[in-house]
Interface confidence: medium
């Protein structure tokens, strides 16, 4: 029996709609800053890429530097959008200037999304300096925000990551230091109860110390996160992304109290250089 | 479908001004970074400069001076030339984008001959 | 200002064979690069962008390579309707914070014996 002549149109319909898709120009990337594009030195600051749904890479490429990041930690935003967040960790001056969103969605890459640029203060806490730009973003139709002089900006809120990290490290040792004292102390009053040890069988066995480099590392976020987006270009080979052949690298960052993790779909990767900061990175491929 | 086209080229005399169109149609200039590009009879692609989507306008730095692009609507680029000498004689191509330019008009012959 | 080195200025080469044009920027402009072809009264046509993308249409004879300052276009399998001047140009796009423009490579002839 031969196919109804409607059913027949529609499907012709869809085909000629999904053949105009494809041919279609993909909509430009927008590119926006959290907490804002003025950041006190030392704080974070993630820049969110924004594109439709389908996407497979992002890049925050760097203006002036030809350097780059790209993502495959995709997460949908709404029905019709997808984003990446590329995040510093804590901002310096060397991460000022101008930034911008690509994607890749095959088979083809976007054109770029307009500048955003950073721009990095030194914290000076007075209640009419803000210390960030609230809300920045770029896309396709806009200029970055220029908020700089807005008064009720928020100042930024929390400790700079070096103190928290001070603040963590004296604690533990404080811990550390009380549960020693209530071993010893719970240990002298079994003395006092029981008499001396008969044998060293009955000794109390030490406390043991738990590993707390491995404990942080195990606890801590896998988001794909950009530290201090190192200054090296990643060659990267385009066609291995349309292939799909992305090899996964885990990258661990080991920065004395700052033990993060981030896992990043890295395509062709090349040699993880440590950055100006001294930042070290240890990189495992995993296949 | 979108398209790209420059105006129609002309004879002028050295020293004269001179402005071409790019008439875009199928996308928004909004949207899109949009260049001139320019070839002497004979010889290679010379870029001029680009207007970006946001207004800003770059120039190679012989261009500088002498040549101004701008938005003139939402569906005109043009490119104003002055000071022209003989070494400007060349067909200008009007073309869309950054990293993907795909779109170029037909081109335009521009002749600088007294 | 970016300047872009092509070579070879003209290359010839048999149906079925392989040509290799080179390309190297002056700076590292990481991986904005295109690569067009340009067939006489005509306008040029983009084969490859950001370095090795295929542009949409064009046949994966047409391999873009390279990062940095260093790219290559290799055409294989030649055709006669290859024989055309090809460029490649830097597509960084300028902004206030560079001056790279966007120049293109003097051009290589390829004709097909």
């Known amino acids: 029996m031969s196919p109804h002549p409607t059913a027949l149109l529609g499907l012709v319909l869809c085909l000629a709609q999904t053949i105009h898709t494809q041919e279609e120009d993909l909509p430009r990337p927008s590119i926006s800053a959290e907490p804002g594009t003025v950041i006190p030195l030392g704080s974070h600051v993630t820049f969110v890429c924004r594109g439709p749904v389908g996407v497979q890479t992002f890049r925050l490429e760097r203006d002036s530097r030809s350097t780059y990041n790209d993502t495959e930690d995709v997460s949908q935003a709404s029905p019709s959008e997808s984003e990446a967040r590329f995040r510093i960790d804590s901002v310096r001056e060397g991460n000022a200037g101008l930034y911008r969103c690509i994607y890749y969605k095959p088979p083809k890459w976007s054109e770029q999304s307009d500048y955003l640029e950073l721009l990095v203060k030194e914290s000076s806490g007075g209640p009419d300096s803000p210390d960030t730009e609230p809300g920045s973003s770029a896309g396709p139709t806009q200029r970055p925000s220029d908020n700089s002089h807005n008064e009720h900006a928020p100042a930024s809120q929390g400790l700079k990551a070096e103190h928290l990290y001070i603040l963590i490290g004296v604690s533990v040792v404080f811990l550390f230091c009380l549960l020693l004292l209530v071993l010893f102390c719970l240990h002298r009053q079994n003395q006092i109860k029981q008499g001396p040890p008969r044998s060293k069988d009955e000794e109390q066995k030490p406390q043991q110390r738990p590993d707390l480099a491995v404990d942080v590392l195990e606890r801590t976020a896998d988001k794909a996160t950009v530290n201090g987006l190192p200054e090296k270009d990643r060659e990267t080979d385009t066609s291995a992304l349309a292939a799909g052949s992305s090899q996964e690298v885990t990258y661990a960052q080991l920065d004395h109290w700052a033990l993060t993790q981030r896992t990043a779909r890295a395509v062709s990767p090349q040699s993880t250089k440590p950055m100006a900061e001294s930042i070290t990175y240890a990189a495992v491929a995993r296949h | 479908s979108s398209s790209v086209e420059e105006s129609e080229g002309r004879l002028v005399t050295p020293g004269t001004p001179l402005t071409l169109t790019c008439t875009v149609s199928?996308?928004?200039?909004?949207?899109?970074?949009m260049g001139w590009v320019r070839q002497a009879p004979g010889e290679g692609l010379e870029w001029i400069g680009t207007t970006s989507n946001d207004g800003s306008t770059y120039y190679a730095s012989w261009a500088k001076g002498r040549f101004t692009i701008s938005k003139t609507s939402s569906t005109t680029v043009d490119l104003m030339m002055t000071s022209l000498t003989t070494e400007d004689t060349a067909t200008y191509f009007c073309v869309r984008g950054t990293n993907i330019r795909s779109l170029w008009g037909p081109g335009t012959l521009v002749t600088i001959s007294s | 200002e970016l300047v872009m080195t092509q070579t070879p200025a003209s290359v010839e080469a048999a149906v079925g064979g392989t040509v290799t044009i080179k390309c190297q920027a002056s700076q590292s402009i990481g991986s904005n690069l295109a690569w067009y072809q340009q067939k006489p009264g005509q306008p040029p046509k983009l084969l490859i962008y950001?370095?090795?993308a295929l542009a949409s249409g064009v046949s994966s004879r047409f391999k873009g390579s390279g990062s940095g300052s260093d790219f290559t276009l290799t055409i294989s399998d030649l055709e006669c309707a290859d024989a055309a001047t090809y460029y490649c140009?830097?597509?960084?796009?300028?902004?206030?914070?560079?001056?790279?423009?966007?120049?293109f490579g003097g051009g290589t002839e390829v004709e097909i014996k």
């Open positions: 950001l370095a090795s």
């Open positions: 199928g996308f928004s200039l909004s949207s899109y970074t």
């Open positions: 140009q830097c597509t960084y796009g300028s902004s206030n914070n560079n001056n790279y423009g966007d120049p």
